[in-house]
Structure formats: C-alpha cells, structure tokens
Amino acid sequence: AMHVAQPAVVLASSRGIASFVCEYASPGKATEVRVTVLRQADSQVTEVCAATYMMGNELTFLDDSICTGTSSGNQVNLTIQGLRAMDTGLYICKVELMYPPPYYLGIGNGTQIYVIDPEPCPDSD
C-alpha cells in the first residue's frame, strides 16, 4: 500500500478539538485525492468523515461534518471537533489517489486520540 504517516498519539483540547497531520507518499502526480478518517474501537471500524479534493485546492468536508482540514502538497491537516471522553480511540487516516488512474490506496497506522471531558466549574458563592 501507499505509505501514510500520522502521529501515534494526540490529546484533544479541553474544548474537545483534536488536530493531526496525515502525510502520504504519492507514487505519481495525482490530481484528485480522497481522505477518509476512520475510527477503530475494539474490532469495529466506522467512518468519521471523508473529503475529496483536487490538488492545489482546499479540502472540503460536508457542512455537517465534525471534521475540517487543509491540504498542502502531500500533507493534510485534519481537525476533529466536538469530541467527548467516549470518543477516545484510534483514528485512522485513509488516503486514496482517485485520478488519474491507476488507483492507489494507503492506510495510516492510526492516531490514538485521548479526550478528557472538562471538570464542571464549581458553583461560586
């Protein structure tokens, strides 16, 4: 498979936001790239979000997506929002070179995202 690199561990902010870079080694000059974030919990794999972009253009996720991102060359900067403690898990970056042919696929080893719910503020007298 195509080589895909991503950090091993990321800690989400107190506001439930986690960011990481997904970098891939392209064999050629792809013009259309699809990036998918998958969450693996136990043996279950679910799709978190996905975006297709043209090289040189911005990465656009659906309006209701919890992900946002920017692209630069063979790097994609991904941000996942609205995370809670129960969302702690392994987040895998999947990269597909869609056009021109041939099709190339790469799967990262995953980024373990730790999410800690903030303590509620104590009541003030």
Epitope: A1, A25, S26, P27, G28, L38, P102, Y103, I107
Partner: antibody, heavy 115, light 107 residues
C-alpha cells in the same frame, strides 16, 4: 492511447529460464507501480510480482509461488518492465500479463513449460 | 496473507436480470478491493476500483459496494455483452490476491 505490449514468451523446458519484457506507452511510466499477473490454463488470475517506482526506492514484492525463482525489474528510461523467470516448472505454464497497478493491462504473452 | 472468498463460482442468468457477486476477505481491507471483467480470449479489464468506483469506459449497469470484509458487485440489468468471468482482488497490500472468479453465462 495507453499501451502495454508483452514479449518474450515461448516454449521452455522444466528447469529452464526465460525473460519476459513489457513495453509501455501513452502514460507516465515512471509514476506507476508495475505488476505481473498470470493465468494458467483453466485457472484464475494469479498476482506474481510488483515493482514500485523511484519515490518508493523500486521496492519489489513477490507471491510465495514465485519468490526466489522470478525477478521483476524495470528501466524507466526505456518505459519497460521485465520478469526474469528461472527454475521453471510445468505449473508455470500460462498467459503472463503486465499491468500498471491493475488499471492498464497488456494483451499477454504465452509461456509453455514442457519437455 | 489476505484470503479472498468469491461466490458463486458460476452463475447463469437471463437478459435483464439483476446479478450479484460477492467477495469476502479474511481481514478488513478498508475498501481496498478491485473488480475485473475478463472476456474469453481477452485481457482483464478494471471494472470497479476502491470497492465502489466505476472505472472509466465501463457501463453504469455495474456497481460495487461494501466495506470491511464484505464486498459486492452488482449488474443492474444483464446484457448479453456481460458474459465473462469476474474477479475481485485485494489491493490493500501484498500479496495482491485475486478471488477465484465467477463465470457468468446467459440462460
């Protein structure tokens, strides 16, 4: 127009050697990983070998059935990929296809291993 | 190594029928699955790539679906021209194993 043209097939005795060539045109050869796939008579498709390109340090991969006997190589200056086949067995008989990462395929060349 | 279990091995259907071929993998291949069409005496042709994407020049009667370990190739309305053997293939990692093939015939 994309073209992959295999050559070098023929009749060879068990234990013998043969070298297949595949000439590519119509696409950027050096951007692609190249593969050899075969089809034995009455059997299905079998992936044999892959050679990646310069960004991947020309890494090679082989199926267990040919590892140690077959060698894949490429020459980007000639837009060509090769399969050196040694210690041939009768079960290596079949049509051999070269393919650019499975998107583009050649017409195939027949290798017959028989005494 | 990733094992590919393709079924059925052969199939006879009538013109206009909806046809389904399945491929099961021994482990999650994350959608890294291609389908090929091989007509008698011809080279294989890429039909579907990445589990769901129709290859250029192939009829929209063909569609691919699936994820994880279970994948499906569907022909919405069988044409006489669809007589061929169909193969699935793992393209996630080496060895890039093919399924055993499904020979499709017209009744």
């Amino acid at each position: 127009e994309v073209q992959l043209v295999e050559s070098g097939g023929g009749l060879v005795q068990p234990g013998g050697s043969i070298r297949l060539s595949c000439a590519a045109s119509g696409f950027t050869f050096s951007d692609n990983w190249m593969n050899w796939v075969r089809q034995a008579p009455g059997k299905g498709l079998e992936w044999l070998a892959q050679i990646r390109n310069k960004p991947y340090n020309y890494e090679t991969y082989y199926s267990d059935s040919v590892k140690g006997r077959f060698t894949i190589s490429r020459d980007d200056s000639k837009n060509s990929v090769y399969l050196q086949m040694n210690s041939l067995k009768t079960e290596d008989t079949g049509v051999y296809y070269c393919t650019a990462q499975f998107a583009y395929w050649g017409q195939g060349t027949l290798v017959t291993v028989s005494s | 190594d990733i094992q590919m279990t393709q079924s059925p091995s052969s199939l006879s259907a009538s013109v206009g029928d909806r046809v389904t071929i399945t491929c099961r993998t021994s482990e999650n291949i994350y959608g890294g699955l291609n389908w090929y069409q091989r007509k008698q005496g011809k080279s294989p042709k890429l039909l579907i790539y990445g589990a769901t994407n129709l290859a250029s020049g192939m009829s929209s009667r063909f569609s691919g679906s699936g994820s994880g370990t279970d994948y499906t190739l569907k022909i919405s309305s069988l044409h006489p021209d669809d007589v061929a053997t169909y193969y699935c293939q793992n393209v996630l990692r080496s060895p890039f194993t093919f399924g055993s093939g499904t020979k499709l015939e017209i009744k």
